[in-house]
Amino acid sequence: MAVTACQGLGFVVSLIGIAGIIAATCMDQWSTQDLYNNPVTAVFNYQGLWRSCVRESSGFTECRGYFTLLGLPAMLQAVRALMIVGIVLGAIGLLVSIFALKCIRIGSMEDSAKANMTLTSGIMFIVSGLCAIAGVSVFANMLVTNFWMSTANMYTGMGGMVQTVQTRYTFGAALFVGWVAGGLTLIGGVMMCIACRGLAPEETNYKAVSYHASGHSVAYKPGGFKASTGFGSNTKNKKIYDGGARTEDEVQSYPSKHDYV
């Protein structure tokens, strides 16, 4: 029962995590204009992995895609790659884990196969979560570097009458969504691996061996292992885990058309 619950919970947590990774990857607010010195700005800039946007105080928002592939920074390309790999691995992991769930019966699939599939999906979730965390962290590091570089530039070349205020960017909402989502996927993967450990040893089917002692007819079954194949039906109770009735509230709140102080 505990194994089923751990497996089911791992699946749900991973599902939420992967949904979060997808959301973070698609979001435009990976980096947002730093408003430390100017809390109410007439023109607000923010950037995502795929496009950059400008929101005017009038409410008009214009987004432009990065229509070049070669002209983009290598780091941005790397972040994109990490996030996409994370999504792909996570999606495959979800697909595998659906069939691995104890509460779902598919033909005469053995528990050992389910254990292997649970482990496979768990590893996939762990790698997926690590990819997302790595991608977000690389982008965050890039932001921090650029932030301090632009801060240094802001205080140079101010000798003339005309001031050119450089736009500085700070962490956007997508980074926090990505970190949390990556963490959840990682936790879900670990839970799947733990569930696999619970499934594997106990669920491995061994044929019972008969030992004939003199004068007695004793059927010896090795302790700790369950006799199943070739010895009648598996009588262990299977509890059905209802993992589909759960609904998760939308956590990410997107900025409204007008954000005022």
């Epitope: 204009q33 800039n45 009038s58 736009t167």
Partner: antibody
Framework: QAYLQQSGAELVRSGASVKMSCKAS????????IHWIKQTPGKGLEWIGY????????NYNQKFKAKATLTADTSSSTAYMQISSLTSEDSAVYFC???????????WGQGTLVTVSA | DIMMTQSPSSLTETAGEKVSMSCKSS????????????LTWYQQKPGQPPKLLIY???TRESGVPDRFSGSGSGTDFTLTISSVQAEDLAVYYC?????????FGAGTKLELK
């Protein structure tokens, strides 16, 4: 087509306050900022501030923060500006305007002339 | 606050001539995010509110005659009327739409000979 109708001219005594209105039509009132601009022969055009009727959020020019109060009534699609402690410096034409692309003002009211008498 | 300086304060031209007026800002009005300049030009005739002519420094508002054009970037901007007409007699203002508080130039008064 957006249209802004402002209230009539006001003659007020020094030290008193005045409240003028700006009735909007032809667009969704709660979706756009209403800005207020002061015009005097001496200082030209000066931006006072704006109100976003959707949530009542305001942003003032620091120069006018203690002088002007912006409000809006969504039920009548009307924006209001109250100017307090009037002095001769406050004698001007006050315009309301709706914002547009590039943080510009595409639609303007006809203006409200405020004359402060001693 | 961003200071907007317009020049000349007034100019007199003959109908049909090309006219240019300048607007300079104390800070750059160019937004790096979309490479647009947040400068607006208005025309104001006596007894009327200002009328929007050009936004984003060079985008002409619909209904504005194509003889009006805006140019410039960063801190230096120009409004050009390719062939002045009698109805263009007015005061022309530039406005900063990049940083609060929004500020206007003192205006350039266009008169006809």
């Amino acid at each position: 087509q957006a249209y802004l109708q402002q209230s009539g001219a006001e003659l007020v005594r020094s030290g008193a306050s005045v409240k003028m209105s700006c009735k909007a039509s032809g667009y969704t009132f709660t979706s756009h900022n209403i800005h207020w601009i002061k015009q005097t022969p001496g200082k030209g055009l000066e931006w006072i501030g704006y109100i976003y009727p959707g949530n009542g959020g305001t942003n003032y020019n620091q120069k006018f923060k203690a002088k002007a109060t912006l409000t809006a009534d969504t039920s009548s699609s009307t924006a209001y500006m109250q100017i307090s402690s009037l002095t001769s410096e406050d004698s001007a034409v006050y315009f309301c305007a709706r914002d547009y692309y590039g943080n510009s003002f595409a639609y303007w009211g006809q203006g409200t002339l405020v004359t402060v008498s001693a | 606050d961003i200071m907007m300086t317009q020049s000349p304060s007034s100019l007199t031209e003959t109908a049909g001539e090309k006219v240019s007026m300048s607007c300079k800002s104390s800070q750059s009005l160019l937004n790096s995010g979309n490479q647009k300049n947040y400068l607006t030009w208005y025309q104001q005739k006596p007894g009327q509110p200002p009328k929007l002519l050009i936004y984003w420094a060079s985008t002409r508002e619909s209904g504005v005659p194509d003889r009006f054009s805006g140019s410039g970037s960063g801190t230096d901007f120009t409004l050009t009327i390719s062939s002045v007409q009698a109805e263009d007699l007015a005061v022309y203002y530039c406005q900063n739409g990049y940083r609060f508080p929004f500020t206007f130039g003192a205006g350039t008064k266009l008169e006809l000979k």
